[in-house]
Amino acid sequence: QPDAINAPVTCCYNFTNRKISVQRLASYRRITSSKCPKEAVIFKTIVAKEICADPKQKWVQDSMDHLDKQTQTPKT
């Protein structure tokens, strides 16, 4: 889980080792702060859980692409 030591900087120290179904993901944000030990992606699920993931993994990239497309699609 993400850890906010000195708010407002949130860092990830461990990544999930399981894929999260894209149907469960609501949004994401990238962690690129130099105050953090590693770059990360934090996914927020539909039940508001936050999960740290490795941006180098393909499933993470696919999930971000999927969420980006969802955001671009206008609601009918």
Epitope: N17, R18, S21, Q23, S27, I46, V47, K49, I51, W59
Partner: antibody
Framework: QVQLVQSGAEVKKPGASVKVSCKVS????????MHWVRQAPGKGLEWMGG????????IYAQKFQGRVTMTEDTSTHTAYMELSSLRSEDTAVYYC????????????WGQGTLVTVSS | DIVMTQSPDSLAVSLGERATINCKSS????????????LAWYQQKPGQPPKLLIY???TRESGVPDRFSGSGSGTDFTLTISSLQAADVAVYYC?????????FGQGTKLEIK
Amino acid sequence: QVQLVQSGAEVKKPGASVKVSCKVSGYTLTELSMHWVRQAPGKGLEWMGGFDPEDDETIYAQKFQGRVTMTEDTSTHTAYMELSSLRSEDTAVYYCATHDFWSAYFYYWGQGTLVTVSS
Amino acid sequence: DIVMTQSPDSLAVSLGERATINCKSSQSVLYGSNNKSYLAWYQQKPGQPPKLLIYWASTRESGVPDRFSGSGSGTDFTLTISSLQAADVAVYYCQQHYSTPCSFGQGTKLEIK
């Protein structure tokens, strides 16, 4: 395409334990979230538990807490469900079920394993 | 925990007629941001594992005949078979996958009248 192949039928005495296996092919086990669902004769589907990647842990239905253990052997791509202190009401078909990365529903099911508890 | 309740428990319908099964959840399974309800319908025939028919309350799984349709949102859902075929005799279950633990309805047995 995920395939789930379960171990064969078992007959157990009350008080004993049973361990049912579910071998995964087509995906690696760590890419999936394996769940177990049982069905007593003539009854409905009952979720027993499964791996929740959002909490990074195995979650068990309250009814089975302390009596069920779900484990994985990643080297053989096999998931296991062990139920202890068996009683006659545990006679049921036990299914493993999972979904792939693009889904959140149980699209893939094992063929089922009949466990009969009888003295 | 979310409790799923189906009605009726059993249903007898003539071939070619419409069959309607209802499912109610004790809490909403709708995620407002994507306006999707995390509700699935399964069909189970004797001696077989369940088969996914519909997800997100109304999206038909590929290969499922279009006589099957799902509707509803939030807490109230319906599975409709527009023209019953002999192959549709089975038990039907709804399931929520919005929150853990996931839960199934008790099932509705569909028979031919």
